[in-house]
């Protein structure tokens, strides 16, 4: 599991007495999300490494839906709209939490399962490696 | 909270009977990410909008610590390494779940959070609104 | 509700020193918000004085403000503050406390400040 | 530091008037520019960013344009509640020590 810092209450998660199972409660708390006016909305559009967004779903997953991005490119779309292939499109990946229904279909049973999604692109000079 | 679709033996979750409160197992379990053999880890650096990586910690989150990008530059960075000005680089943002503390120091109760996380930096064109 | 408070203003003496806060509801500066502190003299324009970012804990001042004035924050308690040194009769205003409109990871607070507080009186007089 | 020059810095109109209020920087900030209505006794209000882009809940007889040094923020046709002092205001930096958000003089727009 994720290490959790010492805290007065809490213990560390690597102590044999921290809780494996936990009770979660489901009420989701949008925390600063709601005060955001300018969200990445259309920058998959306006990007100069643009991607497509791509919907996983999986009923057995919290959340079932999350969107992927794909970069429309291997090179970087210039000024004047064409690509240049000197430049790479690559998409920036995160790792997130979700909960996965474990034993399958139980309703309130989960375990915290770590996936990699991407979240977007951006446009990187390409390594060369030089042959001695 | 987050609709489940509906499953055998899952009712949705605007359901009167779905659980709020849920058990979850903390050993992670990761899916995908050991097989991933390129990380976005120099990406910060080689982008045309670079970023730096912060870390936010919080002893009442699970997880405790996640890193935060943050554009270097407002503009993008050109082949010649100056900055070019006309562009934007923009922080590629994504709302992820967290596990908060509820009641605070609580050590096997918590609740679901949301919260807006920026991944990277993407380099976009400008919006530029002509007036009629 | 999304508001900032500002507190702490008052009357002190030339040469003094005065803390301001800023108190922030319905929105957690967990992440990057940009919060700035701007002031207004009586029936003049606004400066501003330099903001901080809550993520990294960054500060920008104005050239004016370096020095002698000092943006801290405590994320714990969503706050920021003002602190203002060597005080003196040009610098009673009106100080306002406000956040900047792009949230997360954005170079600099560039895109305007779409929330302020009400503001809070200094004076400094003898 | 980059100076912002506004102008006028008073101006007198009536309701349905286009109204134009201009601002100058002393050097190139691109883009980076916001523009505020302040109120007697009250917080200013963000009305503009990044010089044209309107902000959420402004009326669409605002408008902002401009690029580099010299911006103009344009009331296509006055209405009451618009008599207020407006400001201009740069959002430019390269590094922390080089980062301006400068405001403009200000312009009270009265009735004529």
């Known amino acids: 599991g994720i290490a959790i810092p010492r805290n007065s209450g809490c213990p560390n998660s690597e102590d044999k007495n921290f809780p494996r199972t936990v009770m979660v409660n489901l009420n989701i708390h949008n925390r600063n999300t709601s005060t955001n006016p300018k969200r990445s909305s259309d920058y998959y559009n306006r990007s100069t490494s643009p991607w497509n967004l791509h919907r996983n779903e999986d009923p057995e997953r919290y959340p079932s839906v999350i969107w992927e991005a794909k970069c429309r490119h291997l090179g970087c779309v210039k000024a004047d709209g064409n690509v240049d292939y000197h430049m790479n499109s690559v998409p920036i990946q995160q790792e997130i939490l979700v909960l996965r229904r474990e034993p399958r279909h139980c309703p309130n049973s989960f375990r915290l399962e770590k996936i990699l999604v991407s979240v977007g692109c951006t446009c990187v000079t390409p390594i060369v490696h030089h042959v001695a | 909270g987050i609709a489940i679709p509906r499953n055998s033996g899952c009712p949705n979750s605007e359901d009167k009977n779905f659980p709020r409160t849920v058990m979850v197992n903390l050993n992670i379990h990761n899916r995908n990410t050991s097989t991933n053999p390129k990380r976005s880890s120099d990406y910060y650096n080689r982008s045309t909008s670079p970023w730096n990586l912060h870390r936010n910690e919080d002893p009442e989150r699970y997880p405790s610590v996640i890193w935060e990008a943050k554009c270097r530059h407002l503009g993008c960075v050109k082949a010649d390494g100056n900055v070019d000005y006309h562009m934007n680089s923009v922080p590629i943002q994504q709302e992820i779940l967290v596990l908060r503390r509820e009641p605070r120091h609580c050590p096997n109760s918590f609740r679901l959070e949301k919260i807006l996380v920026s991944v990277g930096c993407t380099c976009v064109t400008p919006i530029v609104h002509h007036v009629a | 509700e999304v508001q900032l408070v500002e507190s702490g203003g008052g009357l002190v003496q030339p040469g003094g020193s005065l803390t301001l806060s800023c108190a922030a509801s319905?929105?957690?500066?967990?992440?990057?918000?940009?919060m700035c502190w701007v002031r207004q003299a009586p029936g003049k324009g606004l400066e501003w004085i330099g903001c901080i970012d809550t993520g990294d804990g960054t500060t920008y001042y104005a050239s004016w403000a370096k020095g002698r004035f000092t943006i801290s924050r405590d994320n714990s308690k969503n706050t920021v503050y003002l602190q203002m040194n060597s005080l003196r009769a040009e610098d009673t205003a009106v100080y306002y406390c406000a956040r900047d409109a792009a949230y997360g990871g954005y170079a600099y607070p560039a895109h305007g400040m779409d929330l302020w507080g009400p503001g809070t009186l200094v004076t400094v007089s003898s | 530091d980059i100076q912002m020059t506004q102008s006028p810095s008073s101006l007198s109109a009536s309701v349905g008037d286009r109204v134009t209020i201009t601002c100058q920087a002393s050097?190139?900030?691109?883009?980076?520019l916001s523009w505020y209505q302040q109120k007697p006794g009250k917080a200013p209000k963000l009305l503009i960013y990044?010089?044209?882009t309107l902000t959420s809940g402004v009326p669409s007889r605002f408008s902002g344009s401009g690029s580099g040094t010299d911006f103009t923020l344009t009331i296509s046709s006055l209405q009451p509640e618009d008599f207020a002092t407006y400001y201009c205001?740069?959002?430019?930096?390269?590094?922390?020590?080089?980062?301006?958000?400068?405001f403009g003089g200000g312009t009270k727009l009265t009735v004529l």
């Open positions: 205001q740069s959002n430019f930096g390269t590094a922390s020590t080089t980062y301006y958000n400068t």
């Open positions: 050097e190139s900030i691109y883009r980076y």
């Open positions: 990044l010089a044209s």
């Open positions: 319905g929105f957690s500066f967990s992440g990057f918000y940009y």
